[in-house]
Interface confidence: low
Protein backbone atom coordinates (compact mmCIF):
# COMPACT_ATOMS: atom_id res chain seq x y z
CA UNK A 1 0.00 0.00 0.00
CA UNK A 2 1.36 3.36 -1.03
CA UNK A 3 1.81 5.99 1.61
CA UNK A 4 1.75 9.70 1.05
CA UNK A 5 5.08 11.09 -0.08
CA UNK A 6 6.01 14.76 0.10
CA UNK A 7 8.04 15.54 -2.98
CA UNK A 8 10.25 18.59 -3.26
CA UNK A 9 11.56 17.99 -6.76
CA UNK A 10 14.11 20.78 -6.71
CA UNK A 11 17.17 19.94 -4.66
CA UNK A 12 18.25 23.54 -5.06
CA UNK A 13 16.82 26.74 -6.45
CA UNK A 14 18.91 29.72 -7.43
CA UNK A 15 17.16 33.10 -7.46
CA UNK A 16 18.36 36.63 -8.07
CA UNK A 17 17.85 39.11 -5.27
CA UNK A 18 14.65 41.08 -5.73
CA UNK A 19 13.01 38.31 -7.71
CA UNK A 20 10.51 35.68 -6.65
CA UNK A 21 11.56 32.20 -5.53
CA UNK A 22 9.25 29.32 -6.31
CA UNK A 23 9.58 26.34 -3.98
CA UNK A 24 7.90 23.22 -5.33
CA UNK A 25 6.16 20.69 -3.12
CA UNK A 26 3.79 17.97 -4.17
CA UNK A 27 1.92 15.50 -2.01
CA UNK A 28 1.27 12.25 -3.83
CA UNK A 29 -1.93 11.58 -1.96
CA UNK A 30 -4.91 13.45 -0.59
CA UNK A 31 -4.89 11.42 2.60
CA UNK A 32 -4.31 11.76 5.44
CA UNK A 33 -6.24 15.02 5.65
CA UNK A 34 -4.29 17.89 7.12
CA UNK A 35 -2.46 21.07 6.30
CA UNK A 36 0.96 21.74 4.83
CA UNK A 37 3.49 23.99 6.49
CA UNK A 38 6.75 25.34 5.15
CA UNK A 39 9.79 25.80 7.34
CA UNK A 40 13.28 27.13 6.85
CA UNK A 41 15.73 24.83 8.56
CA UNK A 42 15.06 21.67 10.53
CA UNK A 43 14.80 20.79 14.18
CA UNK A 44 13.36 22.74 17.08
CA UNK A 45 14.74 26.08 15.93
CA UNK A 46 13.17 25.94 12.48
CA UNK A 47 11.44 29.08 11.21
CA UNK A 48 7.84 28.95 10.03
CA UNK A 49 7.58 30.38 6.52
CA UNK A 50 4.00 29.47 5.64
CA UNK A 51 1.09 27.77 7.35
CA UNK A 52 -1.79 26.70 5.14
CA UNK A 53 -4.19 26.74 8.05
CA UNK A 54 -3.57 30.08 9.74
CA UNK A 55 -1.34 33.10 9.98
CA UNK A 56 -0.36 36.08 7.87
CA UNK A 57 2.56 35.65 5.47
CA UNK A 58 2.64 38.74 3.24
CA UNK A 59 5.64 37.69 1.15
CA UNK A 60 4.33 34.19 0.47
CA UNK A 61 1.80 33.16 -2.15
CA UNK A 62 0.75 29.67 -3.16
CA UNK A 63 1.14 28.39 -6.70
CA UNK A 64 -2.24 26.66 -6.68
CA UNK A 65 -5.50 27.04 -4.83
CA UNK A 66 -5.05 25.30 -1.50
CA UNK A 67 -8.74 25.65 -0.75
CA UNK A 68 -9.51 22.91 -3.28
CA UNK A 69 -9.99 19.53 -1.60
CA UNK A 70 -8.19 17.68 -4.36
CA UNK A 71 -5.09 19.87 -4.30
CA UNK A 72 -1.75 18.11 -4.15
CA UNK A 73 0.45 21.04 -5.17
CA UNK A 74 1.75 22.90 -2.15
CA UNK A 75 4.36 24.95 -3.95
CA UNK A 76 4.89 28.48 -2.72
CA UNK A 77 6.34 31.68 -4.08
CA UNK A 78 8.38 33.96 -1.86
CA UNK A 79 8.56 37.49 -3.21
CA UNK A 80 11.31 40.08 -3.14
CA UNK A 81 14.04 37.64 -2.22
CA UNK A 82 17.06 38.97 -0.35
CA UNK A 83 20.31 37.20 0.55
CA UNK A 84 18.93 36.77 4.08
CA UNK A 85 16.36 34.31 2.68
CA UNK A 86 19.02 31.74 1.78
CA UNK A 87 18.67 28.38 3.46
CA UNK A 88 17.01 24.98 3.18
CA UNK A 89 13.23 25.01 3.01
CA UNK A 90 11.15 22.01 4.05
CA UNK A 91 7.59 21.26 3.02
CA UNK A 92 5.93 19.39 5.89
CA UNK A 93 2.61 17.54 5.77
CA UNK A 94 0.56 17.50 8.97
CA UNK A 95 -2.19 15.02 9.86
CA UNK A 96 -5.37 16.47 11.29
CA UNK A 97 -5.47 15.77 15.01
CA UNK A 98 -7.12 16.77 18.21
CA UNK A 99 -6.38 19.08 19.77
CA UNK A 100 -3.34 19.73 17.57
CA UNK A 101 -2.29 18.59 14.13
CA UNK A 102 0.55 16.08 14.11
CA UNK A 103 3.58 16.20 11.82
CA UNK A 104 3.26 13.34 9.38
CA UNK A 105 5.97 13.60 6.71
CA UNK A 106 8.54 16.09 5.50
CA UNK A 107 9.98 16.69 2.08
CA UNK A 108 13.69 16.28 1.49
CA UNK A 109 14.20 20.04 1.45
CA UNK A 110 15.04 22.62 -1.17
CA UNK A 111 18.13 24.71 -0.74
CA UNK A 112 17.44 28.27 -1.74
CA UNK A 113 20.53 30.11 -2.89
CA UNK A 114 20.24 33.81 -3.55
CA UNK A 115 22.13 35.49 -6.31
CA UNK A 116 22.67 39.13 -5.42
CA UNK A 117 24.32 41.53 -7.81
CA UNK A 118 27.38 43.44 -6.67
CA UNK A 119 26.96 47.17 -6.29
CA UNK A 120 28.57 49.40 -8.88
CA UNK A 121 32.31 49.44 -8.20
CA UNK A 122 33.53 52.68 -6.67
CA UNK A 123 37.10 53.62 -7.55
CA UNK A 124 38.99 56.03 -5.34
CA UNK A 125 42.36 57.57 -6.03
CA UNK A 126 44.95 59.17 -3.74
CA UNK A 127 43.99 62.23 -1.69
CA UNK A 128 46.85 64.30 -3.11
CA UNK A 129 48.12 64.69 -6.63
CA UNK A 130 51.35 62.99 -7.65
CA UNK A 131 53.86 63.65 -10.38
CA UNK A 132 54.96 61.42 -13.25
CA UNK A 133 57.20 58.46 -12.36
CA UNK A 134 55.53 58.17 -8.99
CA UNK A 135 53.41 55.15 -8.04
CA UNK A 136 49.92 55.85 -6.75
CA UNK A 137 47.28 53.56 -5.27
CA UNK A 138 43.70 53.20 -6.37
CA UNK A 139 41.04 51.34 -4.44
CA UNK A 140 37.93 49.65 -5.77
CA UNK A 141 35.00 48.54 -3.64
CA UNK A 142 31.80 46.64 -4.40
CA UNK A 143 29.28 45.28 -1.95
CA UNK A 144 26.23 43.11 -1.40
CA UNK A 145 26.88 40.25 -3.79
CA UNK A 146 26.18 36.55 -3.48
CA UNK A 147 27.43 33.91 -4.10
CA UNK A 148 30.96 34.70 -2.93
CA UNK A 149 32.77 33.86 -6.16
CA UNK A 150 33.68 37.07 -7.97
CA UNK A 151 36.38 38.27 -10.35
CA UNK A 152 37.97 41.71 -10.24
CA UNK A 153 40.32 43.13 -12.85
CA UNK A 154 42.13 46.44 -13.18
CA UNK A 155 42.83 48.25 -16.43
CA UNK A 156 44.66 51.40 -17.41
CA UNK A 157 43.56 52.66 -20.82
CA UNK A 158 42.40 49.16 -21.74
CA UNK A 159 45.61 47.47 -20.66
CA UNK A 160 45.20 45.01 -17.81
CA UNK A 161 47.15 45.77 -14.66
CA UNK A 162 48.84 43.09 -12.60
CA UNK A 163 50.01 44.94 -9.49
CA UNK A 164 46.97 44.75 -7.23
CA UNK A 165 45.67 42.99 -4.13
CA UNK A 166 42.07 41.91 -3.62
CA UNK A 167 40.10 40.74 -0.59
CA UNK A 168 36.58 39.34 -0.37
CA UNK A 169 34.90 39.64 3.00
CA UNK A 170 33.80 37.96 5.09
CA UNK A 171 35.94 34.85 4.74
CA UNK A 172 33.25 32.55 6.15
CA UNK A 173 29.63 31.92 5.18
CA UNK A 174 27.49 35.02 4.82
CA UNK A 175 24.29 36.14 3.17
CA UNK A 176 26.29 38.62 1.09
CA UNK A 177 29.87 39.67 0.48
CA UNK A 178 32.05 42.68 -0.26
CA UNK A 179 35.20 43.02 -2.34
CA UNK A 180 38.05 45.47 -1.82
CA UNK A 181 41.00 45.82 -4.16
CA UNK A 182 44.02 48.12 -4.24
CA UNK A 183 45.99 48.63 -7.44
CA UNK A 184 49.31 50.41 -7.89
CA UNK A 185 49.71 52.61 -10.96
CA UNK A 186 52.88 54.31 -12.18
CA UNK A 187 52.10 57.75 -13.57
CA UNK A 188 53.57 59.08 -16.81
CA UNK A 189 53.53 62.59 -18.28
CA UNK A 190 50.96 61.42 -20.83
CA UNK A 191 48.40 60.31 -18.24
CA UNK A 192 46.21 63.42 -18.09
CA UNK A 193 43.71 61.72 -20.41
CA UNK A 194 44.22 58.26 -18.92
CA UNK A 195 41.59 56.25 -17.07
CA UNK A 196 41.90 53.54 -14.47
CA UNK A 197 39.07 51.01 -14.62
CA UNK A 198 38.02 48.43 -12.05
CA UNK A 199 35.96 45.65 -13.60
CA UNK A 200 33.86 43.24 -11.55
CA UNK A 201 32.45 40.02 -13.02
CA UNK A 202 29.85 37.98 -11.16
CA UNK A 203 27.44 35.19 -12.05
CA UNK A 204 24.49 37.57 -11.60
CA UNK A 205 25.78 39.92 -14.28
CA UNK A 206 25.34 37.43 -17.14
CA UNK A 207 28.67 38.18 -18.75
CA UNK A 208 28.24 41.95 -18.61
CA UNK A 209 30.70 43.10 -15.93
CA UNK A 210 30.28 46.23 -13.86
CA UNK A 211 32.90 48.91 -14.19
CA UNK A 212 34.08 51.75 -12.01
CA UNK A 213 36.42 54.38 -13.38
CA UNK A 214 38.79 57.02 -12.14
CA UNK A 215 40.28 59.71 -14.34
CA UNK A 216 43.99 60.21 -13.80
CA UNK A 217 43.39 63.89 -14.47
CA UNK A 218 42.16 63.99 -10.85
CA UNK A 219 45.38 62.38 -9.64
CA UNK A 220 48.26 63.61 -11.75
CA UNK A 221 50.27 66.80 -11.52
CA UNK A 222 52.56 67.49 -14.47
CA UNK A 223 55.02 70.24 -13.51
CA UNK A 224 55.77 72.91 -16.10
CA UNK A 225 58.98 73.53 -17.95
CA UNK A 226 60.05 77.17 -18.19
CA UNK A 227 61.90 78.99 -20.94
CA UNK A 228 62.76 82.69 -20.84
CA UNK A 229 63.58 84.35 -24.14
CA UNK A 230 64.52 87.84 -25.13
CA UNK A 231 62.59 88.96 -28.18
CA UNK A 232 63.66 91.51 -30.79
CA UNK A 233 63.42 95.16 -29.86
CA UNK A 234 59.88 96.45 -29.99
CA UNK A 235 60.87 100.10 -29.95
CA UNK A 236 63.83 102.28 -29.08
CA UNK A 237 65.07 101.39 -25.57
CA UNK A 238 62.47 98.59 -25.09
CA UNK A 239 63.12 94.87 -24.90
CA UNK A 240 60.39 92.21 -24.90
CA UNK A 241 61.16 89.21 -22.70
CA UNK A 242 58.83 86.16 -22.79
CA UNK A 243 58.42 83.30 -20.36
CA UNK A 244 57.12 80.12 -21.97
CA UNK A 245 55.42 77.82 -19.46
CA UNK A 246 54.97 74.44 -21.10
CA UNK A 247 53.37 71.07 -20.51
CA UNK A 248 51.72 71.54 -17.13
CA UNK A 249 48.62 70.15 -15.49
CA UNK A 250 46.33 71.07 -13.82
CA UNK A 251 45.76 74.64 -14.95
CA UNK A 252 46.15 76.40 -11.59
CA UNK A 253 49.29 78.48 -12.05
CA UNK A 254 50.58 81.89 -10.93
CA UNK A 255 53.52 83.65 -12.57
CA UNK A 256 55.61 86.47 -11.10
CA UNK A 257 58.18 88.61 -12.96
CA UNK A 258 61.10 89.89 -10.93
CA UNK A 259 63.56 92.54 -12.07
CA UNK A 260 66.77 92.19 -10.08
CA UNK A 261 64.81 90.38 -7.42
CA UNK A 262 62.02 92.92 -7.16
CA UNK A 263 58.50 91.96 -8.08
CA UNK A 264 57.50 93.57 -11.30
CA UNK A 265 54.21 91.86 -12.11
CA UNK A 266 52.14 88.89 -10.93
CA UNK A 267 49.49 87.19 -13.05
CA UNK A 268 47.36 84.06 -13.00
CA UNK A 269 47.15 81.77 -15.98
CA UNK A 270 43.69 81.87 -17.50
CA UNK A 271 43.77 81.74 -21.27
CA UNK A 272 45.88 78.68 -21.97
CA UNK A 273 46.42 76.44 -24.92
CA UNK A 274 45.83 72.73 -24.51
CA UNK A 275 48.16 70.09 -25.87
CA UNK A 276 46.96 66.80 -27.33
CA UNK A 277 48.08 64.99 -24.20
CA UNK A 278 45.87 67.21 -22.05
CA UNK A 279 48.65 69.35 -20.60
CA UNK A 280 48.66 73.12 -21.00
CA UNK A 281 50.99 75.79 -22.36
CA UNK A 282 51.03 79.46 -21.42
CA UNK A 283 53.22 82.43 -22.30
CA UNK A 284 53.79 85.66 -20.40
CA UNK A 285 55.80 88.60 -21.60
CA UNK A 286 57.48 91.54 -19.94
CA UNK A 287 58.36 94.79 -21.69
CA UNK A 288 61.55 96.15 -20.15
CA UNK A 289 62.54 99.78 -20.55
CA UNK A 290 66.32 99.50 -20.97
CA UNK A 291 66.93 103.20 -20.56
CA UNK A 292 65.61 103.02 -17.02
CA UNK A 293 68.47 100.74 -16.04
CA UNK A 294 72.10 101.72 -15.76
CA UNK A 295 73.35 98.26 -14.97
CA UNK A 296 72.58 94.82 -16.36
CA UNK A 297 69.12 93.51 -15.45
CA UNK A 298 68.42 90.03 -14.09
CA UNK A 299 64.92 89.09 -15.14
CA UNK A 300 63.35 86.16 -13.36
CA UNK A 301 60.17 84.28 -14.34
CA UNK A 302 58.86 82.62 -11.17
CA UNK A 303 56.02 80.11 -11.39
CA UNK A 304 53.93 78.65 -8.59
CA UNK A 305 52.00 75.68 -9.94
CA UNK A 306 49.10 74.00 -8.16
CA UNK A 307 50.24 75.16 -4.74
CA UNK A 308 53.70 73.66 -5.10
CA UNK A 309 56.96 75.45 -4.26
CA UNK A 310 57.82 78.03 -6.89
CA UNK A 311 60.26 77.30 -9.69
CA UNK A 312 61.99 79.98 -11.63
CA UNK A 313 64.06 80.72 -14.68
CA UNK A 314 66.26 83.78 -15.05
CA UNK A 315 67.57 85.78 -17.96
CA UNK A 316 70.35 88.37 -17.87
CA UNK A 317 69.62 91.46 -19.88
CA UNK A 318 72.76 93.40 -20.73
CA UNK A 319 71.88 97.07 -20.92
CA UNK A 320 75.21 97.93 -22.53
CA UNK A 321 74.74 95.47 -25.29
CA UNK A 322 73.14 96.35 -28.60
CA UNK A 323 69.52 95.32 -28.30
CA UNK A 324 69.67 92.28 -30.49
CA UNK A 325 67.70 89.08 -29.83
CA UNK A 326 69.43 86.89 -27.31
CA UNK A 327 69.29 83.09 -27.12
CA UNK A 328 66.84 81.21 -25.02
CA UNK A 329 67.74 79.44 -21.82
CA UNK A 330 67.29 75.79 -21.06
CA UNK A 331 63.91 75.01 -19.52
CA UNK A 332 63.63 74.19 -15.83
CA UNK A 333 61.18 71.52 -14.83
CA UNK A 334 58.64 71.93 -12.06
CA UNK A 335 55.12 71.02 -11.01
CA UNK A 336 52.31 73.13 -12.40
CA UNK A 337 48.61 73.80 -12.63
CA UNK A 338 46.69 76.44 -14.57
CA UNK A 339 47.86 78.53 -17.49
CA UNK A 340 46.95 81.20 -19.98
CA UNK A 341 48.57 83.01 -22.91
CA UNK A 342 49.08 86.67 -22.23
CA UNK A 343 50.32 88.86 -25.02
Amino acid sequence: EEELQVIQPDKSVLVAAGETATLRCTATSLIPVGPIQWFRGAGPGRELIYNQKEGHFPRVTTVSDLTKRNNMDFSIRIGNITPADAGTYYCVKFRKGSPDDVEFKSGAGTELSVRAKPSAPVVSGPAARATPQHTVSFTCESHGFSPRDITLKWFKNGNELSDFQTNVDPVGESVSYSIHSTAKVVLTREDVHSQVICEVAHVTLQGDPLRGTANLSETIRVPPTLEVTQQPVRAENQVNVTCQVRKFYPQRLQLTWLENGNVSRTETASTVTENKDGTYNWMSWLLVNVSAHRDDVKLTCQVEHDGQPAVSKSHDLKVSAHPKEQGSNTAAENTGSNERNIY
Epitope: L14, T22, T26, D73, A108
Partner: antibody, heavy 122, light 107 residues
Amino acid sequence: QVQLVESGGGVVQPGRSLRLSCAASGFTFSSYGMHWVRQAPGKGLEWVAVIAYDGSNKIYADSVKGRFTISRDNSKNTLYLQMNSLRAEDTAVYYCATTDTKYTLGFAFDIWGQGTMVTVSS
Amino acid sequence: DIQMTQSPSSLSASVGDRVTITCQASQDISNYLNWYQQKPGKAPKLLIYDASNLETGVPSRFSGSGSGTDFTFTISSLQPEDIATYYCQQFTYLPPTFGGGTKVEIK
Protein backbone atom coordinates in the same frame (compact mmCIF):
# COMPACT_ATOMS: atom_id res chain seq x y z
CA GLN B 1 28.21 17.49 -23.79
CA VAL B 2 24.88 16.73 -22.09
CA GLN B 3 23.50 13.46 -23.37
CA LEU B 4 20.80 10.92 -22.60
CA VAL B 5 20.90 7.57 -24.39
CA GLU B 6 18.04 5.08 -24.06
CA SER B 7 18.32 1.36 -24.64
CA GLY B 8 16.41 -1.83 -23.99
CA GLY B 9 13.51 -1.38 -26.39
CA GLY B 10 12.25 -4.14 -28.65
CA VAL B 11 9.30 -6.33 -29.53
CA VAL B 12 7.59 -8.06 -26.63
CA GLN B 13 4.39 -10.05 -26.19
CA PRO B 14 1.48 -8.71 -24.16
CA GLY B 15 1.80 -9.56 -20.47
CA ARG B 16 5.57 -9.80 -20.63
CA SER B 17 8.20 -7.48 -19.18
CA LEU B 18 10.89 -5.20 -20.50
CA ARG B 19 13.45 -3.01 -18.82
CA LEU B 20 14.58 0.26 -20.36
CA SER B 21 17.77 2.06 -19.44
CA CYS B 22 18.85 5.64 -19.91
CA ALA B 23 22.54 6.46 -19.61
CA ALA B 24 23.26 10.08 -18.69
CA SER B 25 26.45 12.02 -19.27
CA GLY B 26 27.68 15.57 -19.31
CA PHE B 27 25.83 16.78 -16.20
CA THR B 28 25.47 16.00 -12.50
CA PHE B 29 22.92 13.22 -12.80
CA SER B 30 22.42 12.87 -9.05
CA SER B 31 21.09 16.42 -8.75
CA TYR B 32 18.19 16.10 -11.15
CA GLY B 33 14.77 14.53 -11.17
CA MET B 34 14.42 12.22 -14.16
CA HIS B 35 11.39 11.47 -16.30
CA TRP B 36 10.10 8.98 -18.82
CA VAL B 37 7.87 10.34 -21.59
CA ARG B 38 6.39 8.19 -24.33
CA GLN B 39 4.86 8.66 -27.76
CA ALA B 40 2.63 6.11 -29.45
CA PRO B 41 3.11 5.84 -33.24
CA GLY B 42 1.49 8.85 -34.91
CA LYS B 43 0.25 10.18 -31.57
CA GLY B 44 1.14 12.89 -29.11
CA LEU B 45 3.40 12.94 -26.08
CA GLU B 46 2.45 11.35 -22.76
CA TRP B 47 4.33 11.76 -19.50
CA VAL B 48 4.93 8.39 -17.80
CA ALA B 49 6.83 8.80 -14.55
CA VAL B 50 9.25 10.90 -12.52
CA ILE B 51 11.82 9.99 -9.91
CA ALA B 52 13.35 12.45 -7.46
CA TYR B 53 17.06 13.19 -7.57
CA ASP B 54 17.75 10.81 -4.67
CA GLY B 55 15.27 8.13 -5.70
CA SER B 56 13.10 8.63 -2.62
CA ASN B 57 10.06 10.03 -4.41
CA LYS B 58 8.40 8.53 -7.46
CA ILE B 59 5.22 9.55 -9.26
CA TYR B 60 3.48 7.70 -12.08
CA ALA B 61 0.84 8.42 -14.65
CA ASP B 62 -2.39 6.59 -13.89
CA SER B 63 -2.06 4.61 -17.10
CA VAL B 64 1.09 2.81 -15.87
CA LYS B 65 0.67 2.88 -12.10
CA GLY B 66 1.23 -0.52 -10.56
CA ARG B 67 2.80 -1.94 -13.71
CA PHE B 68 5.81 0.29 -14.30
CA THR B 69 8.59 1.06 -11.83
CA ILE B 70 10.99 3.94 -12.23
CA SER B 71 14.38 3.70 -10.52
CA ARG B 72 17.86 5.10 -10.76
CA ASP B 73 21.44 4.30 -9.89
CA ASN B 74 23.25 7.55 -9.28
CA SER B 75 26.60 5.78 -9.01
CA LYS B 76 26.13 4.61 -12.61
CA ASN B 77 24.39 7.76 -13.89
CA THR B 78 21.60 5.54 -15.14
CA LEU B 79 17.81 5.76 -15.09
CA TYR B 80 15.59 2.68 -15.47
CA LEU B 81 12.01 1.88 -16.33
CA GLN B 82 10.87 -1.60 -15.45
CA MET B 83 7.76 -2.35 -17.49
CA ASN B 84 5.65 -5.32 -16.40
CA SER B 85 2.32 -6.62 -17.65
CA LEU B 86 2.80 -4.88 -20.94
CA ARG B 87 -0.20 -4.08 -23.09
CA ALA B 88 -0.65 -3.24 -26.75
CA GLU B 89 -1.39 0.37 -25.78
CA ASP B 90 2.08 0.62 -24.25
CA THR B 91 3.53 0.47 -27.75
CA ALA B 92 5.47 3.71 -28.15
CA VAL B 93 8.81 5.36 -28.43
CA TYR B 94 10.05 5.89 -24.85
CA TYR B 95 12.14 8.94 -24.14
CA CYS B 96 14.00 9.74 -20.98
CA ALA B 97 14.14 13.40 -20.21
CA THR B 98 15.35 15.79 -17.58
CA THR B 99 15.26 19.48 -16.84
CA ASP B 100 17.72 22.28 -16.44
CA THR B 101 17.94 23.88 -13.00
CA LYS B 102 17.12 27.25 -14.48
CA TYR B 103 13.52 26.12 -14.64
CA THR B 104 11.74 26.84 -11.43
CA LEU B 105 9.56 23.74 -11.67
CA GLY B 106 10.90 20.34 -12.54
CA PHE B 107 8.71 19.56 -15.53
CA ALA B 108 10.17 21.54 -18.41
CA PHE B 109 12.00 18.96 -20.46
CA ASP B 110 14.95 20.54 -22.17
CA ILE B 111 17.16 17.47 -22.37
CA TRP B 112 15.83 14.43 -24.19
CA GLY B 113 17.27 11.13 -25.27
CA GLN B 114 16.85 9.87 -28.83
CA GLY B 115 14.17 7.41 -27.75
CA THR B 116 13.86 3.63 -27.81
CA MET B 117 10.97 1.83 -29.50
CA VAL B 118 8.84 -0.62 -27.54
CA THR B 119 6.42 -2.73 -29.51
CA VAL B 120 3.91 -4.88 -27.63
CA SER B 121 2.45 -7.40 -30.02
CA SER B 122 1.46 -11.03 -30.09
CA ASP C 1 -5.39 15.68 -15.05
CA ILE C 2 -5.11 19.07 -16.67
CA GLN C 3 -6.41 18.86 -20.22
CA MET C 4 -4.44 20.80 -22.78
CA THR C 5 -6.45 21.56 -25.91
CA GLN C 6 -4.30 22.59 -28.81
CA SER C 7 -5.59 24.06 -32.06
CA PRO C 8 -5.49 23.72 -34.92
CA SER C 9 -4.39 20.11 -35.16
CA SER C 10 -2.69 20.90 -38.45
CA LEU C 11 -2.07 23.87 -40.68
CA SER C 12 -0.47 24.71 -43.96
CA ALA C 13 1.21 28.05 -44.55
CA SER C 14 3.61 29.70 -46.95
CA VAL C 15 7.21 30.56 -46.24
CA GLY C 16 7.29 33.97 -44.56
CA ASP C 17 3.78 33.67 -43.16
CA ARG C 18 2.94 34.37 -39.53
CA VAL C 19 1.78 31.17 -37.86
CA THR C 20 -0.21 31.10 -34.63
CA ILE C 21 -1.06 28.07 -32.50
CA THR C 22 -3.24 28.23 -29.42
CA CYS C 23 -3.30 26.08 -26.34
CA GLN C 24 -6.04 26.11 -23.72
CA ALA C 25 -5.70 24.59 -20.29
CA SER C 26 -8.71 23.11 -18.52
CA GLN C 27 -7.85 25.25 -15.49
CA ASP C 28 -5.51 28.03 -14.46
CA ILE C 29 -1.89 26.98 -14.82
CA SER C 30 -0.36 30.42 -14.30
CA ASN C 31 2.49 30.77 -16.79
CA TYR C 32 3.94 27.30 -16.33
CA LEU C 33 3.65 26.23 -19.92
CA ASN C 34 6.26 25.04 -22.41
CA TRP C 35 6.25 24.73 -26.17
CA TYR C 36 8.15 21.98 -28.00
CA GLN C 37 9.05 21.34 -31.61
CA GLN C 38 9.29 17.78 -32.86
CA LYS C 39 10.59 16.84 -36.27
CA PRO C 40 9.83 13.40 -37.73
CA GLY C 41 11.90 10.66 -36.13
CA LYS C 42 13.45 13.04 -33.61
CA ALA C 43 12.99 13.81 -29.94
CA PRO C 44 11.05 16.93 -29.02
CA LYS C 45 13.00 20.13 -28.58
CA LEU C 46 12.14 22.77 -25.99
CA LEU C 47 11.52 26.15 -27.65
CA ILE C 48 9.65 28.22 -25.09
CA TYR C 49 9.54 27.81 -21.31
CA ASP C 50 7.39 29.56 -18.72
CA ALA C 51 4.95 30.57 -21.49
CA SER C 52 7.08 33.30 -23.00
CA ASN C 53 10.79 32.70 -22.41
CA LEU C 54 12.86 31.72 -25.41
CA GLU C 55 15.18 28.78 -24.78
CA THR C 56 18.84 29.52 -25.47
CA GLY C 57 19.78 29.05 -29.10
CA VAL C 58 16.21 29.14 -30.39
CA PRO C 59 15.60 31.64 -33.23
CA SER C 60 13.78 34.81 -32.23
CA ARG C 61 11.02 34.21 -34.77
CA PHE C 62 9.52 31.85 -32.21
CA SER C 63 7.58 33.42 -29.36
CA GLY C 64 5.00 32.56 -26.77
CA SER C 65 2.50 34.43 -24.65
CA GLY C 66 -0.38 33.90 -22.29
CA SER C 67 -1.13 33.12 -18.70
CA GLY C 68 -3.88 31.36 -16.79
CA THR C 69 -5.71 29.16 -19.27
CA ASP C 70 -5.05 30.64 -22.70
CA PHE C 71 -1.70 30.52 -24.43
CA THR C 72 -0.40 31.37 -27.87
CA PHE C 73 2.64 30.21 -29.79
CA THR C 74 3.76 32.24 -32.80
CA ILE C 75 6.22 31.80 -35.64
CA SER C 76 6.60 35.34 -36.97
CA SER C 77 7.97 34.29 -40.36
CA LEU C 78 7.66 30.64 -41.26
CA GLN C 79 10.84 29.02 -42.61
CA PRO C 80 11.18 25.70 -44.45
CA GLU C 81 13.08 24.21 -41.48
CA ASP C 82 10.10 24.91 -39.23
CA ILE C 83 8.14 22.00 -40.69
CA ALA C 84 7.38 19.97 -37.57
CA THR C 85 4.74 19.18 -34.99
CA TYR C 86 4.46 21.61 -32.09
CA TYR C 87 3.26 20.67 -28.62
CA CYS C 88 2.30 22.71 -25.58
CA GLN C 89 2.82 21.24 -22.12
CA GLN C 90 1.69 22.34 -18.68
CA PHE C 91 3.71 21.61 -15.57
CA THR C 92 1.79 23.32 -12.82
CA TYR C 93 0.06 20.13 -11.80
CA LEU C 94 0.98 16.49 -11.72
CA PRO C 95 0.90 14.77 -14.02
CA PRO C 96 2.40 17.16 -16.56
CA THR C 97 0.23 16.99 -19.65
CA PHE C 98 0.76 17.80 -23.31
CA GLY C 99 -1.52 19.21 -25.95
CA GLY C 100 -2.44 16.99 -28.88
CA GLY C 101 0.05 18.71 -31.18
CA THR C 102 -0.15 20.93 -34.23
CA LYS C 103 1.39 19.72 -37.46
CA VAL C 104 2.82 22.61 -39.47
CA GLU C 105 3.35 22.14 -43.19
CA ILE C 106 4.52 24.37 -46.03
CA LYS C 107 2.09 25.19 -48.84
